[in-house]
Structure formats: C-alpha cells, structure tokens
Interface confidence: low
C-alpha cells in the first residue's frame, strides 16, 4: 500500500511593519513541534502595502481599511483556511508614528484605533497594534539577525549554512536604517554600558547577553533629508537652494509648510520670506557629506565615548549586519559586496552624485523619480552616519555586512518581535526532545 503523506503540522504568524514611509506584511511559518528550536521559523511571504506609512492617514483614517486589504487578502490566500483562527497577527508601528505621537497623542491613537478595527475584521487571531519603542526596534532587529544566523544555537557546525556565518557563537551587531529613525545594537566587549537607557539584558537559550542599543529618532534617511534641507535653507539668500546632495540639473519645488511639518525640523525652523523654494542640484559628494555632518552634534559628550548628540556609544565590537535602508540603498548603488572597501564606496559615491540628472534618469528609467533623485543623498548619508556617527573606520568597514535576507527571511525587527510575543525564544537551552510550551517558565 502506498504511504499517504501526513498533513504538515505547521504554525503561522503575521507581523505588519508599519514604517514611516510604507507598511509591509510578513508571514512566518514553523513546524509546530519544533517551535523552541533555534532557526526553525522562516518567512514565507512579504507583501508591501501600496501607499505611504500609516501616519500619513491622519486626515483620512477611513481609508486605512482599504489600504490594508490587498496584503491581508494575500495572507488569507497563503495561510491555509484551517489555520486562520490560530494565526496571530501583530502590527508594530515605528518612528513615523512615534513622531506623530509627539505632535498629538490623540491623532496617533486615532490612527491606531482604526488600524486595529480594520485588522480585527479578518479571520486571524489579531493580537493588537502598537507603537514599538526605539529600544524594542533595535533589540528585535538584533534578535532577528542572530536567530537567522544560528548564533543562539549551542551546536557548533563544521559547515556554514549562511553566507556570513563564522563558526563561533559571537553575535552580530545590528544596524537598522529606516525613514524616520536608525538603530545601532550590539554586544560590547567587556565594556560597562554607561547609560542605563541603552542597556538591555537578555537570557536566551541558556546564555546571558548584555546588549547596547540606541535608536536615533529623526535620523532615518527621510527625516535626515528634511533636517538637512531645513538647516540649509536658513542660510539661502533667496528661494533657490543649491544642493550638493542632488544631481546636477535636478530641480524640485518644496513647500515650506511641508518642510516644517515634521517635529524633526523644529530646531531649524524660522520665518522665511517665501512659501516655497526650489532645490537645484549641483551634485558634489564632498560638500553633501560636509552638510550632513552638521546634523551630528559631536561637541559635547557626558560619557567616555559618544556617537553624536551626547548619546553614549561603546567601542564597536565584532561583525555587524546592516539592513533595511542600509541594504536597499547600497544594493541600488551596487555597493553591498564584501570586497568593496570604504575608500572604494566613497569613490563610487563621488562619481554617482556628479552624474547629471538627465543621464541618471536615462540609466535608471524604471525607477520612480522621487526615489531615484534621493540615492545620492541617501548613499552619502549612510557613509556619514557609519563613519562619523558610529565611528566605523576604513579598517572596521569590512566588518559591516549589508544584508537583505538571511535564509530567505528579511533582516529586520519583525521576526524578533514575533518570536518574543509567541514565546518562541526560551531563556534556557531546550532539551533535545521537543517539549511543550508549558515546559518553559
């Protein structure tokens, strides 16, 4: 008689990453009987929601349900119907919503309330929508990449299953760049974390980790650009801003009201004699780099060592995974290879920024102009942030690995968030036999 295949005993989870510029839905899957093993959860789907981030719906909250429909529909298709009721759905909102909450707690709550109502219409086990802290965002990103790299597993392998894996159990640091914030998280070497706000203690799979993390609000690539424009327009003699961070020949009109809409530009706000100004690109990497450095206040530090703006940063230690916009931008610029030195990256950026806008548009005809126009700034900003902000050097640059996916799962905070909320990372090392959830205290 022929053997009948047994039905897969699997579980699913859904996490929505409600970022400042867009929302993405991730579907994760794992074998039910192995949920406490390290490395068994993997991503089966990513669905990017069409449209901006949820914070942009503040004046049109009634459209949120429709905005989320396509990706939630996709989840209904991907996850077997029999599993819908057991599949948890989590939505985490990041810095875009943190900024909205700074402006108005009531408006932020209203957006989240409508998001919750929309998501609870679906047949899944909706577990809530919340604004996660910058510390959580950093911590969950760190958990994600180390979980996927197999760093929490006590079994040393004689072979490497992932490209960045060294056989030791040293964890990777995590560098995350979003639109509105950026996070740095790593285990410092025998270094006291001098500011309690930046210290995290984890016990994972029987091992203790003392982790440093900080989230720099307003230093995501989009908000950093708004900051730079607000700073530079202060000294413009008229409503023309000759900007080295945009390609020669590029022109764009900016509303002053849009510039001052975000809390991130408040420190540069002034009464201008015009309602609009025009950016005119001049494409000069060196000048762009100098302008960006003015966003980092390095003149004071109440600790032994700081990143910028008086924030404690211990000496860098070990390898780092740089993901999200660090990866997307560098991938577009073709600078993610391990073989490309920091000097080479800088040279490439100089050439790229100097290219005329018309030439750039022709070379990258398939790319939306809004995104295309900002790669010179974003690439330069990444270099400035990593080198001057976090104190990477030409030598330590080779310890930065620009990572999009690991083992088919996106690097980012969402997997770590779900692993934590579903209690799938035990404090103690599991026994070799799979045990039920209740075994872990």
């Amino acid at each position: 008689t022929q053997n009948k295949a047994l039905p897969e005993n699997v579980k699913y989870g859904i996490v929505l990453d409600a970022g400042s510029s867009h929302t993405s839905l991730y579907i994760y899957k794992w074998p039910a009987e192995k949920e406490n093993d390290t490395g068994v959860v993997h991503q089966v789907e990513e669905c990017r929601v069409k449209g901006p981030g949820i914070s942009k719906f503040v004046q049109k909250v009634n459209e949120i349900g429709i905005y989320l429909t396509d990706c939630m529909e996709r989840a209904r298709e991907v996850i077997p119907r029999s599993q819908h009721q057991e599949t948890p759905v989590y939505l985490g909102a990041t810095a875009g919503m943190r900024l909205l909450r700074m402006e108005s707690e009531e408006l932020a709550d209203r957006v989240l309330d409508v998001v919750e109502r929309s998501l609870s219409n679906y047949p899944f086990d909706f577990q809530g929508a919340r604004i996660i802290t910058g510390q959580e965002e950093g911590a969950y990103g760190w958990i994600t990449i180390n979980y996927l790299l197999g760093k929490f597993s006590q079994k040393t392998r004689w072979f490497s299953i992932v490209p960045y894996e060294t056989n030791n159990q040293e964890t990777f640091g995590a560098l995350d760049l979003g639109g509105a914030s950026t996070q740095v998280t790593f285990v410092p070497q025998n270094q006291t974390i001098e500011s309690p706000d930046n210290a995290l203690q984890f016990r994972l799979y029987g091992k203790d980790y003392n982790v440093y993390t900080h989230s720099f609000l307003c230093y995501g690539k989009d908000q950093a650009l708004w900051q730079k424009l607000a700073k530079d327009i202060q000294v413009a003699s008229n409503e023309i801003l000759r900007d080295p961070c945009f390609h020669p020949g590029y022109k764009k009109v900016v509303n002053v009201s849009d510039l001052y809409k975000t809390p991130c530009t408040k420190r540069f706000e002034m009464t201008l004699p015009f309602q609009q100004f025009e950016i005119q690109g001049i494409g000069n990497y060196q000048q762009c780099h100098q302008s960006i450095l003015e966003l980092f206040n390095t003149s004071y530090c109440p600790y032994s060592q700081c990143a910028f703006n008086g924030i404690f940063l211990p000496p860098l230690q070990g390898d780092f995974g740089a993901f999200s916009a660090f990866y997307f931008v560098m991938k577009f610029l073709n600078l993610t290879s391990e073989k490309v030195s920091q000097e080479k990256v800088t040279e490439m950026m100089k050439k790229f920024c100097a290219q005329p806008w018309e030439e750039i548009k022709t070379s990258y005809a398939g790319v939306k102009e809004k995104y295309l126009s900002e790669y010179c700034f974003s690439g330069t900003y990444i270099l400035s942030l990593l080198l001057q902000g976090y104190h990477f050097t030409a030598d330590s640059w080779e310890h930065i690995h620009f990572i999009g996916k690991i083992q088919g799962s996106d690097a980012g905070w969402t997997l770590g968030y779900m692993l934590n909320l579903t209690n799938m990372i035990p404090a103690e090392q599991p026994l070799s036999t799979p045990l039920s959830h209740s075994t872990y205290v």
């Epitope: 429709i66 409508v114 609870s120 219409n121």
Partner: antibody
Framework: EVQLVESGGGLVKPGGSLKLSCAAS????????MHWVRQAPEKGLEWVAY????????YYVDTVKGRFTISRDNAKNTLFLQMTSLRSEDTAMYYC????????????WGQGTTLTVSS | DIQMTQSPSSLSASLGERVSLTCRAS??????LSWLQQKPDGTIKRLIY???TLDSGVPKRFSGSRSGSDYSLTISSLESEDFADYYC?????????FGGGTKLEIK
C-alpha cells in the same frame, strides 16, 4: 443549513437587566465573529455590538457602551448579550448575525427576539 | 462614524417595473457595502455584498453597482415577493452603519 435562533427577550422595567442568547448551528461557530443588531418599532436597523471568534476583539455602538456586554461560549455554540441599566429607547427587536471577513459580513441572520422596556 | 444616506425612503411600484435604490456614504468605503432585504415578518436576508456581488440563491433580477461614493441596488423586473424593506450596510469600518431603509410597496 445555517441557523441562528435568538431567545431571552421580554418585558423589563427601565433600569432593569436582561440577557439575550443566540444559539448557532449548521456552521463552525468558533470560526465566526458575531454581531447583535437591533430594530426599534417602525425604525431602521441599528448595529449594536460585535465579538470576534476568540472573544479578543469587542466593539459596541456608543449608546450601549458600559451598559451592554457581548460574550460567547464556543463550546456551546452560543452568543450572549447581557443588558443592564435598560432604557425605553432600548426597546427593539434584537437580531444576531454572523461575520467571517468581508465576503461573509452579516450574511446570515436570526429571526430576532423582542425586548420591551416599559414601566 | 460613517453615515449612510439611503433614498428614497419609500417607493411604490408595479409588478414588472424596474426600480433603483441608492445609498451614499459620507466617507470612502471602498466598495465594502451590502444590501439586505427585510420581509414583513421580520426575516432578514443578505442579497448583495462587496457592492455588486450577488449572494448565492438570490435571483438575477437583483444587481448592485457603484459610482464613486454612490451605491445602487436595482431590481430589473419586480415580482410580488420583492415587496419588502431594503437596507444598505457599510462594513469598511466600525461602527457598522446602515442606511435608513427603503420601503418598497405595491402600487
């Protein structure tokens, strides 16, 4: 065949309490969210409350918040509406209806049970 | 809350006649609208969901359509069992809201 049967209606004095039930059959009750909808005499339909399949999500119309409690017992395939501090304006026919995502929003209804609030 | 304005509130028509009822949403509901029929004995039945999709078992003479924020229910040729009350329902957001209803009577 999908069946929803409401019961528990009756005559109550203002300020009084009553608990309505809705017995479900012919479908997997624990898969579905459930609603209570009411209709005052000679008036239109008014949505009252919703409870998700696992009871984790609950919504009420503003006029009943703090007075009505929706609940369910999936083991017994039954939906409830506990009503307290009743007012004359709560007098209505109360219907239960099921809900499973957008294709199945309020797609099957019970026949209703009557509540009269009067002194 | 989303207001649903239904018109007309009552309508007299003859057998075989074509009639249309309309609902207007105060905010965008993206097609998340259904039409319900309530018979004189109080029985409620859903006829249409997602603005234009016919429920199984509902006669083809019923149809739904959308034009911007206006949603219509059309009965192409009235039959005696169609004389009833009709309600639209939006399910784009909570609270769910109904139109005021249309009473369809025999002329």
């Amino acid at each position: 065949e999908v069946q929803l049967v409401e019961s528990g209606g009756g005559l109550v004095k203002p300020g009084g309490s009553l608990k309505l039930s809705c017995a479900a059959s012919g479908f997997t009750f624990s898969d579905y969210g459930m609603h209570w909808v009411r209709q005052a005499p000679e008036k239109g339909l008014e949505w009252v409350a919703y409870i998700s399949s696992g009871s984790s999500v609950i919504y009420y119309v503003d006029t009943v918040k703090g007075r009505f409690t929706i609940s369910r017992d999936n083991a017994k395939n039954t939906l409830f509406l506990q009503m307290t501090s009743l007012r004359s304006e709560d007098t209505a026919m109360y219907y239960c209806a099921r809900d499973l995502y957008y294709d199945h929003v309020l797609d099957s209804w019970g026949q209703g049970t009557t509540l009269t609030v009067s002194s | 809350d989303i207001q649903m304005t239904q018109s007309p509130s009552s309508l007299s028509a003859s057998l075989g006649e074509r009639v249309s009822l309309t609902c207007r949403a105060s905010q965008e509901i993206g097609g998340y609208l259904s039409w319900l029929q309530q018979k004189p004995d109080g029985t409620i039945k859903r006829l249409i969901y997602a603005a234009s999709t016919l429920d199984s078992g509902v006669p083809k003479r019923f149809s739904g359509s959308r034009s911007g924020s206006d949603y219509s229910l059309t009965i192409s040729s009235l039959e005696s069992e169609d004389f009833a009350d009709y309600y639209c329902l939006q399910y784009a957001s909570y609270p769910r809201t109904f139109g005021g209803g249309t009473k369809l009577e025999i002329k």
